[in-house]
């Protein structure tokens, strides 16, 4: 005849076998994953007495020192969780929940996807154009993103004895700024009591050893009686643009 | 498919320029970098110098300024390194190389002699 | 500029065995760097990017590992077809550089 037991929501739970308690949460077994994220698997069960819970990978063992920086388990949680996973992380997660009265088990297939290596990506909308008054002060945004170290230069178009071309038909450049040993926070360019002079077009330049992108902001420089018309405010936006 | 073709062999005499081609195709020319690198047998492999299609730019390493110039071609997808002053130091195997690194070209083998 | 320091210079491996190689940088160049296949008549073959990324198409029994000055590539279960020389790159700065190579010969 069947046992009970007191469970804490105090209703009386019959002894037996593991039992899956939520299904739906291990629907999905393929999880592709880009590399360096974390990734979590969760198989909640219930039963009793209390089961226990192992995790196996490619139906061996799974033990810590199997991957660098090795894993956590949250038993509460009836989770794994592997952080930073690379491509030798790929491969079938068995969970195995077990008690005295029976085991069952499910099985997720990790399949870790490698970055592509690309030229960098520069955020949508930035830098955005600007309006200051004469004397004002002015910041510009580049937010970008490379998986390679990216080179970041701010340049501006100037003139040159009241040209903008050189003999070539190229336009005078001058490099406001760019990242380096002496350069911190390289996606910022600060301008500090502007004339008339600095109005103009600045662009954002990233490099890395694949390729290049660039953007560029207006700045309009307004005499100091007139107040400046503030910008649309700027949402940064989850789109990227190359 | 990607591909970057090269000329098999350059024979020079010292003293004299040559200039080199790499015809790549399959991919936007003008969104990679294209990367020149020597190889002879003493010294294994050596990064020349990068030149961006799409405007021009180029990066050098200061061990070839002055000898190597890169030059890029939209319209057919050609990019060029030219050596001057050649001397027997000069001979190796120039390869273009995409910008990830990914794709090369067969190499062209530089031979200067008289 | 970053000098890469590879080693060893040479290894004779037999069919089956674990090859290790590492490339030490001079200076900081976080997972900058990839490796190379280099075999006689042909062209470097990329393996390994961004430090410890394998390249599409490359046999999972070619790894890498490291970052900041200090990587490891390694072949698990060296075949006679991998007979080559392997180079180091580092992808951070300007002049991109090159270790100076490891052979590796098999018995």
């Known amino acids: 005849r069947p046992s009970f037991s007191l469970v804490e929501d105090t209703t009386l739970e019959p002894e037996g076998a593991p039992y899956w308690t939520n299904t739906e949460k291990m629907e999905k077994r393929l999880h592709a994953c880009p590399a360096a994220n974390t990734v979590k698997f969760r198989c909640p069960a219930g039963g009793n007495p209390t089961s226990t819970m192992r995790w196996l990978k490619n139906g061996k063992e799974f033990k810590q020192e199997h991957r660098i920086g090795g894993y956590k388990v949250r038993n509460q949680h009836w989770s794994l969780i592997m952080e930073s996973v690379v491509p030798s992380d790929k491969g079938n997660y068995t969970c195995l929940v077990e008690n005295e009265y029976g085991s069952i088990n499910h099985t997720y297939h990790l399949d870790v996807v490698e970055r592509s290596p690309h030229r960098p990506i520069l955020q949508a909308g930035l830098p955005a154009n600007a309006s200051t008054v004469v004397g004002g002060d002015v910041e510009f945004v580049c937010k970008v993103y490379s998986d390679a170290q990216p080179h970041i230069q701010w340049i501006k178009h100037v003139e040159k004895n009241g040209s903008k071309n050189g003999p070539d038909g190229l336009p005078y450049l001058k490099v406001l700024k760019h990242s380096g040993i002496n350069s911190s926070n390289a996606e910022v360019l600060a301008l500090f009591n502007v004339t008339e002079m600095d109005a103009g077009e600045y662009i954002c330049k990233v490099s890395n050893y694949i390729g290049q992108a660039n953007q560029s902001a207006w700045l309009t420089v307004l005499p100091k009686q007139q107040a400046p018309v503030r910008e649309k405010e700027i949402t940064a936006s989850p789109d990227y643009l190359e | 498919q990607v591909q970057l073709q090269q000329p098999g062999a350059e024979v020079v005499k010292p003293g004299a320029s040559v200039k080199m081609s790499c015809k790549a195709s399959g991919y936007i020319f003008t969104t990679y970098n294209v990367h020149w690198v020597k190889q002879t047998p003493g010294q294994g492999l050596e990064w020349i110098g990068s030149?961006?299609?799409?405007?021009?730019?180029?990066s050098y390493n200061q061990n070839f300024k002055g000898k190597a110039t890169l030059t890029a071609d939209k319209s057919s997808s050609t990019a060029y390194i030219q050596l001057s002053s050649l001397t027997s130091e000069d001979s190796a195997v120039y390869y273009c190389?995409?910008?990830?690194?990914?794709?090369w070209g067969q190499g062209t083998l530089v031979t200067v002699s008289v | 500029n970053i000098v890469m320091t590879q080693s060893p210079k040479s290894m004779s491996m037999s069919v089956g065995d674990r090859v290790s190689i590492t490339c030490k940088a001079s200076q900081g160049v976080s997972n900058d760097v990839a490796w190379y296949q280099k075999k006689p008549g042909q062209s470097p073959k990329l393996l390994i990017y961004?430090?410890?990324y394998r390249y599409t198409g490359v046999p999972d029994r070619f790894t890498g590992s490291g970052s900041g000055t200090d990587f490891t590539f390694t072949i698990s279960n060296v075949q006679a077809e991998d007979l080559a020389v392997y180079y180091c790159q580092q992808h951070s700065t300007t002049p991109y550089t090159f270790g100076g190579g490891t052979k590796l010969e098999i018995k």
């Open positions: 190389a995409r910008g990830d690194f990914a794709y």
């Open positions: 961004s430090a410890s």
């Open positions: 030149i961006y299609p799409d405007n021009g730019d180029t």
